[in-house]
């Protein structure tokens, strides 16, 4: 038979032979030959390979460096890498989560639209008319202005995006 030019899924071509790839969690020790099947060995402690492969070395698990504000979210296995996340109040600077920065606070006049997670920063939005925020916060949303009418009071000072309205008693001298 003619030597193959292409191999099946989970195989690779070497020396005109189709060899089995090593399964996730194992590395290649020896290519298959005319006489032998591919030889694979499990990855060691703190190593992984996450695909069918012909790698002769496993990858090291990611280290979640506490000095960079990182902690382990999910421990790695022989088939998966460690997943890092950030300590409370911090979030990852990139998708790879290699370092952390403090969550952003929303300035007065802005409220929190979406609270930060370990992997995403705080999303702020300007307080629309009828709402305000008078603090710098990573948690506070824009609050609605106080409704003076429901308290049987009148607006003495109009609200802004940073301040609430000021209510006062109704002027009883008026007709």
């Amino acid at each position: 038979p003619e030597p193959p030019t292409a191999c099946r899924e989970k195989q690779y071509l070497i020396n005109s032979q189709c060899c089995s790839l090593c399964q996730p969690g194992q590395k290649l020790v020896s290519d298959c030959t005319e006489f032998t099947e591919t030889e694979c060995l499990p990855c060691g402690e703190s190593e992984f390979l996450d695909t069918w492969n012909r790698e002769t070395h496993c990858h090291q698990h990611k280290y979640c460096d506490p000095n960079l504000g990182l902690r382990v979210q999910q421990k790695g296995t022989s088939e998966t890498d460690t997943i890092c996340t950030c300590e409370e109040g911090w979030h990852c600077t990139s998708e790879a989560c290699e370092s952390c920065v403090l969550h952003r606070s929303c300035s007065p006049g802005f409220g929190v639209k979406q609270i930060a997670t370990g992997v995403s920063d705080t999303i702020c939005e300007p307080c629309p008319v009828g709402f305000f925020s008078n603090v710098s916060s990573a948690f506070e949303k824009c609050h609605p202005w106080t409704s003076c009418e429901t308290k049987d009071l009148v607006v003495q000072q109009a609200g802004t995006n940073k301040t609430d309205v000021v209510c006062g008693p109704q002027d009883r001298l008026r007709a």
Partner: antibody, heavy 115, light 112 residues
Framework: QVQLVQSGAEVKKPGASVKVSCKAS????????IYWVRQAPGQGLEWIGG????????NFNEKFKSRATLTVDTSISTAYMELSRLRSEDTAVYYC????????WGQGTTVTVSS | DVVMTQSPLSLPVTLGQPASISCRSS???????????LHWYQQRPGQSPNHLIY???NRFSGVPDRFSGSGSGTDFTLKISRVEAEDVGVYFC?????????FGGGTKVEIK
């Protein structure tokens, strides 16, 4: 071209040890196992075992496991087979062989065990 | 260990005529990967063995097409379609499916 060149003939006394070498050339030494096979006079072949030069990993015929030692020196692309506690039945031609993209044999090393 | 039994022990042949050697294994040589690791080789007097066929029916590079292999499971055959003078020697089968690898006792092919 691929070549396996073995060390010369040996004469040993019973109880002694012998170390046969197999120098490889013409290919990347660490890419293929080296296997050892022997053939007693007028007899068939017997598989001793193999060694992976990449990591020193071995597999053996259980019959030889306690007496045979397989090693490599990757700096000089050479494999070694040492057989200890020799007896007269170990008199044979010892071959090293490599397969993968063809099969290659050394020229053989005659080991004679005699008192 | 897997026992490999070859027959006949000796095979006198006429030049230009076909020859056939049988090899039986004591257990199946079908590997879990779907391959059957049964091989044939020739040894001329005073020489190292020379492989002819691997995995039942695949000829090594440079092996004349008068050599062919067939079989499956435990029953295998090497055929020489027209024997030539250079074909004299001992023919061995071997298996590398199971450890330890084992060999047949050999079949001596000689010209009548």
């Amino acid at each position: 071209q691929v070549q396996l060149v073995q060390s010369g003939a040996e004469v040993k006394k019973p109880g002694a040890s012998v170390k046969v070498s197999c120098k490889a050339s013409g290919y990347t030494f660490i890419s293929y196992y080296i296997y050892w096979v022997r053939q007693a006079p007028g007899q068939g072949l017997e598989w001793i075992g193999g060694i992976n030069p990449r990591n020193g990993g071995t597999n053996f015929n259980e019959k030889f496991k306690s007496r045979a030692t397989l090693t490599v020196d990757t700096s000089i692309s050479t494999a070694y087979m040492e057989l200890s506690r020799l007896r007269s039945e170990d008199t044979a031609v010892y071959y090293c062989t490599r397969h993968g993209n063809g099969v290659y044999w050394g020229q053989g090393t005659t080991v004679t065990v005699s008192s | 260990d897997v026992v490999m039994t070859q027959s006949p022990l000796s095979l006198p042949v006429t030049l230009g005529q076909p020859a056939s050697i049988s090899c039986r294994s004591s257990q199946s040589l079908l590997h879990s990967n779907g391959n059957t690791y049964l091989h044939w080789y020739q040894q001329r007097p005073g020489q190292s063995p020379n492989h002819l066929i691997y995995q039942v029916s695949n000829r090594f590079s440079g092996v004349p097409d008068r050599f062919s292999g067939s079989g499956s499971g435990t029953d295998f055959t090497l055929k020489i379609s027209r024997v030539e003078a250079e074909d004299v020697g001992v023919y061995f089968c071997s298996q590398t499916t199971h450890v330890p690898w084992t060999f047949g006792g050999g079949t001596k092919v000689e010209i009548k």
